[in-house]
Amino acid sequence: AELFLIASPSHPTEGSPVTLTCKMPFLQSSDAQFQFCFFRDTRALGPGWSSSPKLQIAAMWKEDTGSYWCEAQTMASKVLRSRRSQINVHRVPVADVSLETQPPGGQVMEGDRLVLICSVAMGTGDITFLWYKGAVGLNLQSKTQRSLTAEYEIPSVRESDAEQYYCVAENGYGPSPSGLVSITVRIPVSRPILMLRAPRAQAAVEDVLELHCEALRGSPPILYWFYHEDITLGSRSAPSGGGASFNLSLTEEHSGNYSCEANNGLGAQRSEAVTLNFTVPTGARSNHLTS
């Protein structure tokens, strides 16, 4: 009697199942009690000797490529051996690599967590994922795993993490880069500083007083509000960041406390109050203002 090994499918793709069948074309296995065993190269597969002429392999990988055969043993201990069958496992090259961010859109608050998710639409086997920072890439990390996605995490984002990023996936057919993704780090405004600027050391009535408010940190655009005794004087915008100024033509009623507020949509901060007082110097004809 002759024995044949049949693999289905005969040219499997990585990750897919394969059924090995030990066939006896001129003998019904029911005619006699047989035990079957399947081998790859020199190693027995699965449970070893079994009454089933089939062996199901759940997932085949590139390293499972090799020479397979089976043996059948009768109750009388006669052993039949099949010819060797070469099974080549086909690896699918990585394709369509993409990089996505969590949170989506690449906008993240300073101090928050950022995850860069590298994905491939196709690709089998062990895939090496690499993450790069900057258009001229600085390698951040690499991971090798048997999955179509991998993650790189920045637990607490800093201002210096605002950059372009990309990832690369590779499974033996050459590296394939994703497109670029830009990360914007959103920074809440710091407490602003209010400065009063007058054309002379002692400002007089009718002089123009400049109120300059500046938050040293914070993502633009920043909106500044100016206050006199908690009454709103007006607002100014700094579209590219930096400070903003508000001009005031002085009258005697302008004595008192001044403050400003900075707001960039990520939170508002109020400055310390600055006090302006009118003083009447001895022999002077006009009132003067000091701060």
Partner: antibody, heavy 119, light 112 residues
Amino acid sequence: QVQLVQSGAELVKPGASVKVSCKASGYTFTSYNIHWVKQAPGQGLEWIGWIYPGDGNPKYNEKFKGKTTLTADKSTSTAYMELSSLRSEDTAVYFCARRIHYYDYFDYWGQGTLVTVSS
Amino acid sequence: DIVMTQSPLSLPVTLGEPASISCRSSQSIVHSNGNTYLEWYLQKPGQSPQLLIYKVSNRFSGVPDRFSGSGSGTDFTLKISRVEAEDVGVYYCFQGSHVPWTFGQGTKVEIK
């Protein structure tokens, strides 16, 4: 197939401004940086800077800061370079080029736009 | 700024003969990530530049194997093993390691 098609030649007066366009097709516009390069008549090549179309963020060669403004419009897959306060020394052919990250090279170039500054 | 100096500036060649262009940078162009971003471009008359070599010695797809690049640190060379008529034009070296990125002044290759 990938193409970068630039706007036509411009003749402009000194002190004026000009905006050169570079329309990309055949690939995802927001996936790669677009660079600009200057070539004065009979001269070599000078790198001006790049723009990332994904967020419109430019990076300039210090020499061209104030002279050049780089922008991009994602909706039309077009990059722009605006030259201001034009002088005779700005007369040149200006190229846009796509740069591939990781491999790091300029793989596709526009055909070039001649800007002539003359009164 | 890094200055890229090419020599010679003009190179008359004989068809079928080898040719060599040198490019020297005013300081090392090894990037902090360990790569050397040195490229060679050819600009044929009336055309845009086209890539020949990237990262010192890697030939771009479709570039004939008669072109080869070598070098390290500050000294780099482009070699053409056998010059063909289609190789005429101006050759530029380029460094993309340190901003501002800079080109060499160009080497004009023409047939004798």
